[in-house]
């Protein structure tokens, strides 16, 4: 159940990250670390290194307040079910500095990317006989 | 704003293989997840299956040993083969976005595939 | 396989109606449940996700809620633009499974 809450809510990350996708041009063109090809268990690691990451409106044009509220819902904390869990895989897996840095495009199609991924296995792991490859 | 646009042959033979392919514009194939759906006439909607920009496949065990779903990144495309088919596959065949993985942002109008000697 | 039941198979509204449509799992999906409308001849459209959140440029007449086996969409004031059909469809598994459908017809 508490898994379950922390998916839905990816889901719902994923379509603030399409929208803040349509304003790359009004976000600061800063290089954040943008993890990619994450290695198994270290899933929640590289969300929360999007999650701190600096993303920022450049403060131009009238698009600022629709970025700075879906920036914010961003960062919101999932609820903390099976933190203890996420907080020892952290122990080994890469510190956020250790990432590529990507400028903003990058990092939200990567941010999606990894939210995908971990839905994709939440639905494989109680699924038989669908996955083929 | 992402569309789908789906073609191949309207008519099929029994026991012969079904292909349809689905374009994609305005968006890249590259990121996001890409399926089939159906819905014969007078039914519901049926998921085939899907498949991810990397080229992973999910299939509905009902259709799993006849179905490949493949991708072609480079000319934004991808497609749905259906082998032996029968009477039972004529139906309306969708291809569609998935990009929350678990539901369907964008779909293609659709197309009429019949199955019939 | 999850089995989804729609209720009512068809209802008959006029402008300005709220028309309710239901949708029952054959076992609890949690908030693993999405809407779409789809016209004849029209690509399907998305409307809800996860139970309850509008897909973005979706009119906010639309609205979608419950959990575990039971849900509804509702269309708080009905226009002519709404009448369709409109599918739910379970997310929490393989293979993802639609129900039959409810047709919203002109009373």
């Known amino acids: 159940q508490g898994q379950d809450r922390h998916m839905i809510r990816m889901r719902q990350l994923i379509d603030i990250v399409d929208q803040l996708k349509n304003y790359v041009n009004d976000l600061v063109p800063e290089f954040l670390p943008a993890p990619e090809d994450v290695e198994t268990n270290c899933e929640w690691s590289a969300f929360s290194c999007f999650q701190k990451a600096q993303l920022k409106s450049a403060n131009t044009g009238n698009n600022e307040r629709i970025i700075n509220v879906s920036i914010k819902k961003l960062k919101r904390k999932p609820p903390s079910t099976n933190a203890g869990r996420r907080q020892k895989h952290r122990l080994t897996c890469p510190s956020c500095d250790s990432y590529e840095k990507k400028p903003p495009k990058e990092f939200l199609e990567r941010f999606k990317s990894l939210l995908q991924k971990m839905i994709h296995q939440h639905l494989s792991s109680r699924t038989h006989g669908s996955e083929d490859s | 704003q992402v569309q789908l646009q789906e073609s191949g042959p309207g008519l099929v033979k029994p026991s012969e293989t079904l292909s349809l392919t689905c374009t994609v514009s305005?968006?890249?194939?590259?990121?996001?997840?890409w399926g089939w759906i159906r819905q014969p006439p007078g039914k519901g909607l049926e998921w085939i299956g899907y498949?991810?920009?990397?080229?992973?496949?999910n299939y509905n065990p009902s259709l799993k040993r006849r179905v490949t779903i493949s991708v072609d990144t480079s000319r934004n495309q991808f497609s749905l083969k259906l082998s032996s088919v029968t009477a039972a596959d004529t139906a309306v065949y969708y291809c569609?976005?998935?990009?929350?993985?678990?539901?369907?942002?964008?779909w293609g109008q659709g197309t009429l595939v019949t199955v019939s000697s | 396989d999850i089995q989804m039941t729609q209720s009512p198979s068809s209802v008959s509204a006029s402008v300005g109606d709220r028309v309710t449509i239901t949708c029952r799992a054959s076992?609890?999906?949690?908030?693993?449940l999405a809407w779409y409308q789809h016209k004849p001849g029209k690509a399907p459209k998305l409307l809800i996700y996860?139970?309850?959140s509008l897909q973005s440029g979706v009119p906010s007449r639309f609205s979608g809620s419950g959990s575990g086996t039971d849900f509804t969409l509702t269309i708080s004031s009905l226009q002519p633009e709404d009448f369709a059909t409109y599918y739910c469809?379970?997310?929490?598994?393989?293979?993802?499974?639609f129900g039959g459908g409810t047709k919203v017809e002109i009373k």
């Open positions: 498949i991810s920009s990397r080229g992973s496949t």
């Open positions: 996860v139970a309850s």
């Open positions: 569609a976005r998935s990009a929350g993985v678990t539901d369907f942002d964008f």
């Open positions: 469809q379970a997310a929490n598994s393989f293979p993802l499974t």
């Open positions: 305005g968006g890249s194939i590259s990121s996001d997840f």
């Open positions: 076992q609890g999906i949690s908030s693993w």
